[in-house]
């Protein structure tokens, strides 16, 4: 149904509070360097304009598309060019080119200081002074650092943040109350940000078909009792919602997400019995609850997959008549039977099945050709299973820090051209997957590991695209979304890499390392480790172990010494010489 004024329609649907929050997120995600006050001013102007349109939908400019209204607002900022440089060139373009231009200037890695959490007392004082402004500031700070954060979910986290402060600021021990709550919100929000970033990358880099396939697999796992037609309906709506949010159309996205949640609650009998507990919640919690929903139980007595996809004589006919529907049905049927598989695995299996049919359906006897297709797809299941088992064994043996070190060595050998801080950051992130997933039961380990790896590798790919340094990384990132992880796993020592000349200053330490927090101490040591691998990419595991052992002993000795700096100055060069000899 067409509305005279789109902005009035969204204001009415969303309500003033959510409307203002979404406008603030939109501005903060696009104008990441602007101060909070400037955004607040623009938010108030946009809100006043929307209210005027609610009063009279025929009023001047009320009929304009929301994206055009936002673009006009941004382009009217006097300091736009001096703050944002070439982003101002977008203003010379007409919509929709202008919108695309703004999107291309979103910075996934803005040069902003880390979002530090003030002391509980200071937090509570600021919150009590003006809690709307305080929550607005939270939305602003998160949005500018995460320009693709799923906006309606961010409103949910802001609500959680507000609730935590409301409760804990009245507590006797504010810190004891707040710290675990805010840590949990932060951790969940960071995962949510990475998940949405992967969805946007999937749509933007690999197209709608890739995103729809991902969604069919995920929803079929969660709602195995729903019919394929029902899953397809939800996927179509979900694709629209995701496209809108990824495109920066946050008011439309949030409104359509509400509609999707409403639809799912109205049709819960044909989707999942687990929806009941979500559907009684208010708007934001309802949609969040659906997003995080526990999977439903598998229907009993599902027929063997081979019946419809191998034994049936109509396979090639069905494939020819409606390729995407037939493959979608295969993905649905396979996914609902395998909640323990990762999305990547399911999509690789579907891709393998498709490739087999492409080949076999062109033969004179297709059935003879594809009769053993499931046996041939087995390696796609065995490879990640084996990999997870091996890595979790290594994790159990070494612990998180040791495991991170092993990964730092491994990934530096794969892509030594990548900067040392980046390699350390990703080794640490990859290592933390062990902590998250290896303690889980066997049935959840596999999907946990691969699904997390997909998020981490996506971030690596996005940042690498901005400043490419390794052809191998580019290849793994761009060739196929579902094969990213296997592609990185398959990389070994880069034979084309010319080892970095030895620089003693990369391995020179001072007494200040002794007083650093444990995490920062680890990072420093891991930086040295990566530098070492860049210097000797083909060093054996034994050599690396020896060097790391000597290094740890040196740090312990000097940090325990009375005159720490003298110890570092004297023993440092000896250690460097010893390490060079070990690696010679």
């Amino acid at each position: 149904e067409a509305h005279k004024s789109e902005i009035a329609h969204r204001f009415n649907d969303l309500g003033e509070g959510h409307f203002k929050g979404l406008v603030l997120i939109t501005l903060s995600q696009h104008l990441q360097k602007s101060p909070f006050e400037e955004h607040v001013k623009l938010v108030n102007e946009v809100t006043d304009f929307a209210k005027a349109c609610v009063a009279d939908e025929s009023a001047q400019n009320c009929g304009k598309a929301i994206a055009t209204l936002f673009g006009d607002k941004v382009c009217a900022i006097p300091s736009l060019r001096e703050t944002y440089g070439e982003l101002a060139d977008c203003c010379a373009k007409e919509d929709p080119d202008r919108v695309e231009c703004f999107l291309q200037h979103k910075d996934d890695n803005p040069n902003l200081p880390p979002f530090e959490r003030p002391e509980p007392e200071a937090l509570c004082t600021a919150f009590k002074e003006n809690n709307d402004r305080f929550i607005g500031h939270y939305l602003y700070e998160v949005s500018r650092r995460h320009p693709y954060f799923y906006a309606p979910e961010l409103l949910y986290y802001a609500e959680k943040y507000k609730n935590a402060l409301t409760e804990c600021c009245e507590a006797a021990d504010k810190a004891a109350c707040l710290t675990p709550k805010l840590d949990a919100i932060k951790e969940k929000a960071l995962v949510s940000s990475a998940q949405q970033r992967l969805k946007c990358a999937s749509l933007q880099k690999f197209g709608e078909r890739a995103f729809k396939a991902w969604s069919v697999a995920r929803l079929s796992q969660k709602f195995p009792k729903a019919e394929f037609a029902e899953i397809s309906t939800i996927v179509t709506s979900l694709t629209k919602v995701t496209k809108e949010c990824c495109h920066g159309d946050l008011l439309e996205c949030a409104d359509d997400r509400q509609e999707l949640a409403k639809y799912m609650c109205e049709h819960q009998d044909s989707i999942s019995s687990k929806l009941k507990e979500c559907c009684v919640k208010p708007t934001l919690q309802k949609a969040h609850c659906i997003l995080e929903i526990q999977r439903d139980e598998l229907p009993t007595e599902l027929p063997d997959l081979a019946v419809d996809f191998v034994e049936d004589k109509e396979v090639c006919k069905n494939f020819a008549e409606a390729k995407d529907v037939f493959l979608g049905t295969f993905l649905y049927e396979y996914s609902r039977r395998h909640p323990e598989y990762s999305i990547g695995m399911l999509l690789r299996i579907a891709k393998g099945y498709e490739a087999k049919l492409e080949k076999c359906c062109a033969e004179a006897d297709p059935h003879a050709c594809y009769a053993k297709v499931f046996d041939e797809l087995q390696p796609l299941i065995d490879e990640p299973k084996k990999l997870v088992q091996q890595n979790c064994e290594l994790f159990d043996k070494l612990g998180e820090y040791g495991f991170q070190n092993a990964l730092a060595v491994r990934y530096t050998q794969k892509a030594p051209q990548v900067s040392t801080p980046t390699l350390v950051e990703y080794a640490r992130k990859l290592g933390s997957v062990g902590t998250k997933c290896c303690s889980l039961p066997e049935t959840e380990r596999l999907s946990c590991t691969e699904n997390y790896l997909a998020l981490i590798l996506n971030r690596l790919c996005i940042l690498h695209e901005k400043t490419p340094v390794s052809e191998r990384v580019t290849k793994c990132c761009t060739e196929s979304l579902v094969n990213r992880r296997p592609c990185f796993s398959a990389l070994h020592v880069d034979e084309t890499y010319v080892p970095k000349p030895f620089h003693a200053d990369s391995f020179t330490f001072h007494a200040d390392i002794c007083t650093l927090p444990e995490k920062e101490k680890q990072v420093k040591k891991q930086m040295a480790l990566v530098e070492l691998v860049k210097h000797k990419p083909k060093a054996s595991e034994e050599q690396m172990k020896t060097v790391m052992g000597d290094f740890a002993a040196f740090l312990k000795k000097c940090c325990d010494a009375d005159n720490k700096e003298a110890c570092f100055t004297e023993d440092g060069p000896k250690l460097v010489a010893k390490c060079q000899a070990t690696l010679a």
Epitope: K313, E321, E363
Partner: nanobody, 115 residues
């Protein structure tokens, strides 16, 4: 939408010949193996012959081997069945299918062999 339209059937005396055609549309014809299937009155479908997408591989039921020849012209999206030395037991409705399918999704063309 996939469409298969058969033609070339008719009444022929035993020992005679006919050439059936099947015009295909709505899918990538050259990417799919094709088959001819027949159904005699009051009987179930019987597979007759198959050909690969490129036309390099062919298969025949024992009952027609040496008498029937399957071929295709990918530039015209058309499948053919040359039937020689026809016998009364070849009387049936003939239809073309994609891959190894036996189910009929087209009109078919009737072949009657009778003196």
């Amino acid at each position: 939408e996939v469409q298969l339209v058969e033609s070339g059937g008719g009444v022929v005396q035993p020992g005679g010949s006919l050439r059936l055609s099947c015009a295909a549309s709505g899918f990538t014809f050259r990417s799919f193996g094709m088959s001819w299937v027949r159904q005699a009155p009051g009987k179930g479908p019987e597979w007759v012959s198959s050909i690969s997408g490129s036309g390099s591989d062919t298969l025949y039921a024992d009952s027609v081997k040496g008498r029937f020849t399957i071929s295709r012209d990918n530039s015209k999206n058309t499948l053919y069945l040359q039937m020689n030395s026809l016998r009364p037991e070849d009387t049936a409705l003939y239809y073309c299918t994609i891959g190894g399918s036996l189910s009929r999704s087209s009109q078919g063309t009737l072949v009657t062999v009778s003196s």
